[in-house]
């Protein structure tokens, strides 16, 4: 058997650190057997069998010029093997961050804090931490660890499914290369890392006969689970074209009527979501949707609310993008006490 321990990495490659002494091991001989060493492609002897170093070649203060392939041979000239030297650095603790787009799953991503220059892999696991008593700072023995399954194709991400919203988790990401391993531990709670995906299906429509009104509607992000236990609240921004500043409102439901649009101008609208109890942070903004207020005249009679709604409200099904959920407030009425003021303005 070979006297050379096989480091993790491709076969036939041995590793060292720049500026340090490096020992190369001749793989095809018995431990301690004296060998001769050559640099592949160079005939001069690097180290003879009389060095007293047996099957090892010692390179003092290795540098990049020492990288490459070496040949070792036995006393009678038989090939003992070829060894490729690659220089690099031991792992440093990786940079790790975790995020959750819903309250049941979270993902963690990582990146090296230093480039090692060597083949590198990552071991990812997590354990659940539970608190003993409301006031106690002591922790119970952790449960787990369990592997945090990594995305295929080498994406630096792993996903924890079926997490508990009220639990704390300790994430372990260990960077491993042939020169060692280094671990980053990160404590996370879903509450603090929750950031929903932006709302979907944003539509902006004019309100016939009301030149300063736009109606925006949207749905929950598809990634948000369909149980009604955890609701989202929303923030809507709008602005006329070429206007630098956004106006912001916090709608009560899945639609909002803008009543101070600029007549005749297209308006950009975007919407963001957050857990309704303020866990985590606001989502990124949805893609902008555009709409232009109606330019038509107002109807002679002000229709009732039900007639204005061209699409009847239907409670969405479980598999629809918007989850069934209780309304926190009644839907905003399209016509309110401000209507007459606006009508006067329009008729003036």
């Amino acid at each position: 058997s070979s006297p050379c321990p096989q480091a993790w990495g491709p076969p036939g490659v041995q590793y060292g650190q720049p500026g340090r002494s490096v020992k190369l091991c001749c793989p095809g001989v018995t431990a301690g057997d004296p060998v001769s060493w050559f640099r592949d492609g160079e005939p001069k002897l690097l180290q003879g069998p009389d060095s007293g170093l047996g099957h090892e070649l010692v390179l003092a203060q290795a540098d990049s010029t020492d990288e490459g392939t070496y040949i070792c041979q036995t006393l009678d000239g038989a090939l003992g093997g070829t060894v490729t030297l690659q220089l690099g650095y031991p792992p440093a603790r990786p940079v790790v961050s975790c995020q959750a787009a819903d309250y049941e799953n979270f993902s963690c991503t990582w990146s090296p804090s230093q480039i090692s220059g060597l083949p590198t892999r990552y071991l990812t696991s997590y354990r659940k931490k539970t608190v003993l008593g409301a006031d106690s700072q002591r922790r119970s023995p952790s449960t787990g660890p369990w592997p945090c399954p990594q995305d295929p194709l080498g994406a630096a991400r792993c996903v924890v499914h079926g997490a508990e919203f009220w639990s704390q988790y300790r994430i372990n990401v260990t960077e491993v290369n042939p020169l060692g391993a280094s671990t980053r531990l990160l404590d996370v709670s879903l509450q603090s890392i929750l950031r929903p995906d932006p709302p979907q299906g944003l539509r902006v429509e004019s309100v016939p006969g009301y030149p300063r009104r736009l109606r925006a509607s949207w749905t929950y992000p598809a990634s948000w689970p369909c149980q009604p236990h955890f609701l989202l609240k929303f923030r809507l921004q709008y602005r006329p074209a070429q206007h630098p500043a956004w106006s912001t409102v916090e709608p009560a439901g899945l639609e909002e009527v803008i009543t101070d649009a600029v007549a005749g101008l297209p308006h950009a609208v975007r919407v963001s979501a957050r857990d309704f109890l303020d866990a985590g942070t606001w989502s990124t903004w949805s893609p902008e949707a555009w709409g232009t207020p109606s330019t038509g005249t107002i109807p002679k009679e002000i229709p009732a609310w039900g007639q204005l709604h061209t699409q009847p409200e239907v409670e969405p099904q479980v598999d629809s993008p918007a989850p069934p959920r209780p309304s926190l407030q009644p839907h905003p009425r399209l016509l309110d006490h401000r209507d007459s003021v606006e009508q006067v303005a329009v008729l003036a």
């Epitope: 001769s36 050559f38 005939p43 001069k44 002897l45 003879g48 041979q73 000239g77 038989a78 090939l79």
Partner: antibody, heavy 117, light 107 residues
Framework: QVQLVQSGAEVKKPGASVKVSCKAS????????MHWLRQRPGQGLEWIGN????????HYNQKFKDRATLTVDKSTSTAYMELSSLRSEDTAVYYC??????????WGQGTLVTVSS | DIVLTQSPATLSLSPGERATLSCRAS??????LHWYQQKSGQAPRLLIK???QSISGIPARFSGSGSGTDFTLTISSLETEDFAVYFC?????????FGQGTKLEIK
């Protein structure tokens, strides 16, 4: 015991090619480099090149790089040296030699190649 | 290419005498110098490797010394079978090259 048995003498015309064989026995063929050398009548030794024991990697003397080709047939433990575009000054005894990377420890008996019109 | 110059071209000595053969390299080659013996009609035979390292099966009367550019092969007490041609060879850089040889003949 280690033996290297080379093919017989050859007479070639200028411009022709010659292929000399060297059959090895008595050792594990793929563990040792095989070198090729030549010695012109009354002259010193010239190294032509070597071929790696297992991966057929070669090093050539630039003087012969464009005309010499070293190959091995591992299944028969035989090494070959082909020299093309022969000229009269290629008349020499050609040797195969088992060695390490740079030394010649065991030699074949030699093959006389005569180039004459 | 590294040029090896051997001297003398011919050395005439009697059995029992000490023979000193020289090989000079055109540039420093550390200890990457080897010695071969070739008898008439035979293939060469390795005597000394890396300037001074002995080879199994070679009589102890053969020894080598030197480093850098100047090397010596010494035969402490000549035997009849030692009269032959001796070549030095360098392995410091490609191509591997030989000296032109020193012919050791019986006086």
């Amino acid at each position: 015991q280690v033996q290297l048995v080379q093919s017989g003498a050859e007479v070639k015309k200028p411009g022709a090619s010659v292929k000399v064989s060297c059959k090895a026995s008595g050792y594990t063929f793929t563990n040792y480099w095989m070198h090729w050398l030549r010695q012109r009548p009354g002259q010193g030794l010239e190294w032509i090149g070597n071929i790696g024991p297992s991966d057929s990697k070669t090093h050539y003397n630039q003087k012969f790089k464009d005309r010499a080709t070293l190959t091995v047939d591992k299944s028969t433990s035989t090494a070959y040296m082909e020299l093309s575009s022969l000229r009269s000054e290629d008349t020499a005894v050609y040797y195969c030699a088992r060695g390490d990377y740079v030394l010649f420890t065991y030699w074949g008996q030699g093959t006389l190649v005569t180039v004459s019109s | 290419d590294i040029v090896l110059t051997q001297s003398p071209a011919t050395l005439s000595l009697s059995p029992g005498e000490r023979a000193t053969l020289s090989c000079r390299a055109s540039q420093s080659i550390s200890n990457n110098l080897h010695w071969y013996q070739q008898k008439s009609g035979q293939a060469p035979r390795l005597l000394i490797k890396y300037a001074s390292q002995s080879i199994s099966g070679i009589p102890a009367r053969f020894s080598g010394s030197g480093s850098g550019t100047d090397f010596t092969l010494t035969i402490s007490s000549l035997e009849t079978e030692d009269f032959a041609v001796y070549f030095c060879q360098q392995s410091y850089s490609w191509p591997l090259t030989f000296g032109q040889g020193t012919k050791l003949e019986i006086k």
